[in-house]
């Protein structure tokens, strides 16, 4: 007897990160024996949609015209042989942004910071949110989330960087979020470009948590260190 | 031109409702901004009535005192703000302005106002 | 709630005086403060954002500093035209609000 079906792949196009009113593909790439494809969407009747697959049959598209809230969250899509249902794939995160006005990001004592040094990045939110997002630019896996406990709300959250390498210079941008959903995200930040002087052969600075070797630099997550600040955040690594 | 432009003001007797509209132009409601409404009582200080933000979510934050009284909505296809008034008492009467908050968290662009008069 | 003070309330100056209007908030409002002048019949004018910085086409003769919870606006040679009320605020949108502005300084001719 024949195992389960591969499971299919899903992924989103121009990417899974898409501003309010903006369109956006996902795509579900299964077998050439698909018969239909059937997206579902987390806390959404299923199936979400359904497509016939587009030849060579190996794959379908779901297409959103323009972003809005109700299409943020987490989706899988499944494909119909002859032979039954496949596994689903694994999920698709999609995002929206521009659910909340831009936060204003800051570095303290100065975006220009010695290598070794201590730099802490401020993301500021003129109303209470719950979950400040600091993004590297050009970094693949660049989320560092800081999430208020018990749903109390906060004005802004402090990433520290310590010490301070070559690594750490770049252009930053925060997000915030409320508690409504995570898939809605602020309009980004203005830009803070981070520059570190005298940085030549800087040491790395231990990771917090193991990363995986094949990561090169700009792989790596943002390492700050330590402890949460008393605004009652929680650090989460993505 | 960058400008606020109130209206709907008038005289209004006690209990009544009424619809005040701020229409932007030079910028986008839908942009990355809050919108707040303020009043000010003839002689008085300026009072803050609440605020909503441009993200697409609406976000709307009132003050204490509004107890469901006012409620702030936007119609983006037409760059326009409203503040609908219900249960109106004379200490209602006021110029009411609605101002953009810039990127710098202060009230950076203002409307000239509209005077509501609650009388009998 | 943040509740801004203000004071004076009033101030009688003449042409050429240096003038100071203080604005205290209940707890730190880091540097997200700031500063309007309003003539009646008018709309306020924003002078100052983030307590020190003068907004466009203000003159060089109005500053603010403080941060935290203590806050100031001077006036450093007080000319006709800056015969005024003068209001702070802070930058926080909330619920728990009663109000954003201070009480309001009166600067009137001695």
């Known amino acids: 007897q024949a195992g389960p079906l591969p499971k299919p792949t899903l992924w989103a196009e121009p990417g899974s990160v898409i501003s309010w009113g903006n369109s956006v593909t996902i795509w579900c790439q299964g077998t050439l024996e698909a018969r239909e494809y059937r997206l579902d969407k987390e806390e959404s009747p299923a199936p979400w949609d359904r497509q016939n697959p587009l030849e060579p049959k190996n794959k379908a598209r779901f297409s959103i015209p323009s972003m809005t809230e109700d299409y943020a969250g987490r989706y899988r899509c499944y494909y119909r042989s002859p032979v039954g249902w496949s596994q689903p794939s694994d999920p698709l995160e999609l995002v929206m942004t521009g659910a909340y006005s831009k936060p204003t990001l800051s570095a303290l004592p100065s975006p220009l910071v010695t290598s070794g040094k201590s730099v802490t990045l401020l993301c500021q939110s003129r109303s209470p949110m719950d979950t400040f997002l600091l993004i590297k630019e050009r970094a693949a896996h660049p989320l560092l989330h800081l999430r208020s406990e018990h749903g109390a709300q906060q004005h802004q959250a402090e990433f520290p960087m310590s010490p301070v390498t070559s690594v750490h210079g770049g252009t930053y941008r925060c997000f915030s979020s409320h508690g409504f959903s995570h898939y809605l995200l602020s309009h980004p930040s203005d830009p803070l470009e981070l520059i570190v002087s005298g940085s030549l052969e800087d040491p790395r600075p231990s990771p917090t948590r193991s990363v995986s070797t094949a990561a090169g630099p700009e792989d790596q997550p943002l390492m700050p260190t330590g402890s949460v600040p008393h605004s009652g955040l929680r650090r989460h690594w993505e | 031109e960058v400008q606020l432009v109130e209206s709907g003001g008038g005289l209004v007797q006690p209990g009544g409702s009424l619809r005040l509209s701020c229409a932007a132009s030079?910028?986008?409601?839908?942009?990355?901004?809050?919108i707040s409404w303020v009043r000010q009582a003839p002689g008085k200080g300026l009072e803050w009535i609440g605020s909503?933000?441009?993200?697409?979510?609406?976000?709307?934050y009132y003050a204490t005192w509004v107890k469901g009284r006012f409620t702030i909505s936007r119609d983006n296809s037409k760059n326009t703000l409203y503040l609908q008034m219900n249960s109106l008492r004379a200490e209602d009467t006021a110029v009411y302005y609605c101002a953009r908050h810039g990127d710098n968290w202060a009230l950076d662009l203002w409307g000239q106002g509209t005077l509501v008069t609650v009388s009998s | 709630d943040i509740q801004m003070t203000q004071s004076p309330s009033t101030l009688s100056a003449s042409v050429g005086d240096r003038v100071t209007i203080t604005c205290r908030a209940s707890?730190?409002?880091?540097?997200?403060l700031a500063w309007y002048q309003q003539k009646p019949g008018k709309a306020p004018k924003l002078l100052i954002y983030k307590a020190s910085t003068l907004a466009s086409g203000v003159p060089s003769r109005f500053s603010g500093s403080g941060s935290g919870t203590e806050f100031t606006l001077t006036i450093s040679s007080l000319q006709p035209d800056d015969f005024a009320t003068y209001y702070c605020?802070?930058?926080?949108?909330?619920?728990?609000?009663?109000?954003?502005f201070g009480g309001g300084t009166k600067v009137e001719i001695k």
């Open positions: 030079g910028f986008s409601l839908s942009s990355s901004y809050w």
């Open positions: 909503i933000d441009s993200g697409s979510v609406g976000i709307t």
């Open positions: 605020q802070h930058g926080y949108i909330r619920g728990d609000l009663d109000n954003v």
């Open positions: 707890q730190s409002i880091q540097s997200w």
